[in-house]
């Protein structure tokens, strides 16, 4: 009864197609698979950024796999062949591991890369990224931003840079078609006559960095002798009402401050007949139903009522 063995996959490699972190892992079938012609061979692939504690594991019947990585760090991967029990008279058989690594040879010292990179997707319409030059770099240093997401044929360079003292310190992106709910990859590299500049890589999803416009059309409606309904409208733009959370700040008679977070465009406030003045502001944020994170909008213009009897039916400003 000879022990059944299988070889690891051949030619295992990590290929960089130039997508700024979205890499291809590919391999060829193991040698000597002739004994298992009737078998569907599977492969277990484990991979991670170097320094990460956990491996990501997948099983596939294919000879390739694609995923996103942080190119600021190296990547390590390993793969082995799996023979299901049907191939081997009831015992599972796995090969030894084939291993590979990939990293971009870093140029320049870490301090030369851009600092404080910040990207905001304004109102789910306009992406703007800004950064500060690296520490100690000379004025002849210029930075260039490239980006890619699935759907683009190749990485694109920013065409509308924000400049300060002749240096690129930000990018206004064009309309980004079908770019949300997928990884968005950015590389900011640089050039200088004097010294090499370290590249920086960033990955995020656009729906998670949205800063909406503030709500508009704030109004008051008296619901009863002790209740006032505050209302507002969603800001103009592509974000649907179901995607908003709101934070309200209400001030009564310059003293009482009420803060509340709500999901709808209304809030009912308990008041007393003695209330002489009422002011409120609202801001908006994309909620957990539409994103994993977000940025609060600026506060709306303040809406106040004062000087008249608050028992009047409708109070509009």
């Amino acid at each position: 009864d000879t022990e059944i063995k299988v070889n690891p996959p051949q030619d295992f490699e990590i290929v960089d197609p130039g997508y700024l972190g979205y890499l291809y892992l590919q391999w060829q079938p193991p040698l000597s698979l002739d004994h298992f012609k009737e078998c569907t061979v599977e492969y277990e692939l484990k991979y991670r950024n170097i320094g990460s504690e956990t491996w990501k594991t997948i099983i596939t019947k294919n000879l390739h796999y694609k995923d996103g990585f942080d190119l600021n760090k190296g990547i390590e991967a390993k793969i082995h062949t799996l023979l299901p029990w049907q191939c081997t008279n009831g015992s599972e058989v796995q090969s030894s591991w084939a291993e590979t690594t990939y990293w971009i040879s870093p140029q320049g010292i870490p301090e030369t890369k851009v600092q404080d990179m910040d990207c905001v997707y304004y109102n789910w319409q306009y992406l703007l990224c800004s950064w500060k030059p690296g520490i100690g770099v000379l004025l002849d240093t210029n930075y260039n931003l490239f980006y890619w997401y699935e759907g683009l044929d190749h990485a694109l360079q920013c065409v509308d840079y924000i400049k300060a003292d002749g240096q690129n310190i930000g990018c206004r992106f064009p309309y980004l078609e079908a770019s949300d709910y997928k990884d968005f990859y950015i590389c900011v590299n640089g050039s200088s006559e004097n010294k090499p500049i370290r590249s920086s890589y960033f990955t995020f999803q656009l729906q998670n960095i949205v800063k909406p416009l503030p709500p508009v059309y704030l109004t008051f409606t008296r619901e009863s002798s002790c209740e006032i309904k505050l209302k507002w409208s969603i800001p103009l733009g592509p974000i649907p009402a179901r995607c908003f959370d709101y934070e309200i700040e209400i001030r009564e008679d310059d003293t009482t401050l009420v803060t509340a977070t709500v999901e709808n465009e209304t809030y009912t406030l308990k008041t007393t007949n003695e209330t002489r003045q009422l002011c409120f502001v609202v801001r908006s944020k994309v909620n957990i139903y539409c994103s994993d994170d977000g940025i609060w909008s600026e506060w709306s213009d303040k809406q106040c009522w004062e000087g008249e009897d608050l028992s009047k039916k409708t109070l509009l400003r």
Epitope: T40, I59, K61, N62, Y65
Partner: antibody, heavy 121, light 108 residues
Framework: EVQLLESGGGLVQPGGSLRLSCAAS????????MSWVRQAPGKGLEWVSS????????YYADSVKGRFTISRDNSKNTLYLQMNSLRAEDTAVYYC??????WGAGAFDYWGQGTLVTVSS | DIQMTQSPSTLSASVGDRVTITCRAS??????LAWYQQKPGKAPKLLIY???SLESGVPSRFSGSGSGTEFTLTISSLQPDDFATYYC??????????FGQGTKVEIK
């Protein structure tokens, strides 16, 4: 005849734990990968976890990773799912399923009758 | 993750009708696709595996076709016992194993 019989479901509070069992018969249990699949009330099927025949490899859905543990006792022909830190969204009928062909998962050719797990305070 | 999208979500048909359900994968899954039938309160039942292979004991009016990203389940002549919900499932690459959202076949 292949049979899979789940047990261990019930009502549990959020944050609580439960251990599901699946007793298998009618096939050579120790060589075959097994899986857990769940179905929330009125919803579709959601794969939860799989384990290879030898128990050497385990796989989990992101939604349960770190909270659920799949295991098996081949001497008892039994599959287990230990569920910790339960949440309301874990409420579902849990099915154990036999893998037709493959290392860790594949098409599921036999299913148990299911056991209902309700997470509520 | 590979997403599976079924259409239609609901299908109204009569006994004797030819019924086709479509399943689309977000990336190629070769022929690693299964179809299941589920009736209310019951466990799913495997109908088709490897996109087109009929599971033992399943009536021959059920058939599967397709490869890559587009797949279909066809019931050549709908029988009273066939009113149920049908799910597709990929097992090309995992985790996760992913299912379509289901297609309910109801009486017209």
């Amino acid at each position: 005849e292949v049979q899979l019989l789940e047990s261990g479901g019930g009502l549990v509070q959020p944050g609580g734990s439960l251990r599901l069992s699946c007793a298998a018969s009618g096939f050579t249990f120790g060589t075959i990968p097994m899986s857990w699949v769940r179905q929330a009330p009125g919803k579709g099927l959601e794969w939860v976890s799989s384990i290879s025949g030898s128990a050497g490899s385990t796989y989990y859905a992101d939604s349960v990773k770190g909270r659920f543990t799949i295991s098996r006792d081949n001497s008892k022909n039994t599959l287990y799912l230990q569920m910790n830190s339960l949440r309301a969204e874990d409420t579902a009928v849990y099915y154990c399923a036999k893998v037709r062909y493959g290392w860790g998962a594949g098409a599921f050719d036999y299913w148990g009758q299911g056991t209902l797990v309700t997470v509520s305070s | 993750d590979i997403q599976m999208t079924q259409s239609p979500s609901t299908l109204s048909a009569s006994v004797g009708d030819r019924v086709t359900i479509t399943c689309r994968a977000s990336q190629s899954i070769s022929s690693w696709l299964a179809w299941y039938q589920q009736k209310p309160g019951k466990a799913p039942k495997l109908l088709i595996y490897d996109a087109s292979s009929l599971e033992s004991g399943v009536p021959s009016r059920f058939s599967g076709s397709g490869s890559g990203t587009e797949f279909t389940l066809t019931i050549s002549s709908l029988q009273p016992d066939d009113f149920a919900t049908y799910y597709c499932q990929q097992y090309d690459t995992y985790p996760p194993i992913t299912f379509g959202q289901g297609t309910k076949v109801e009486i017209k």
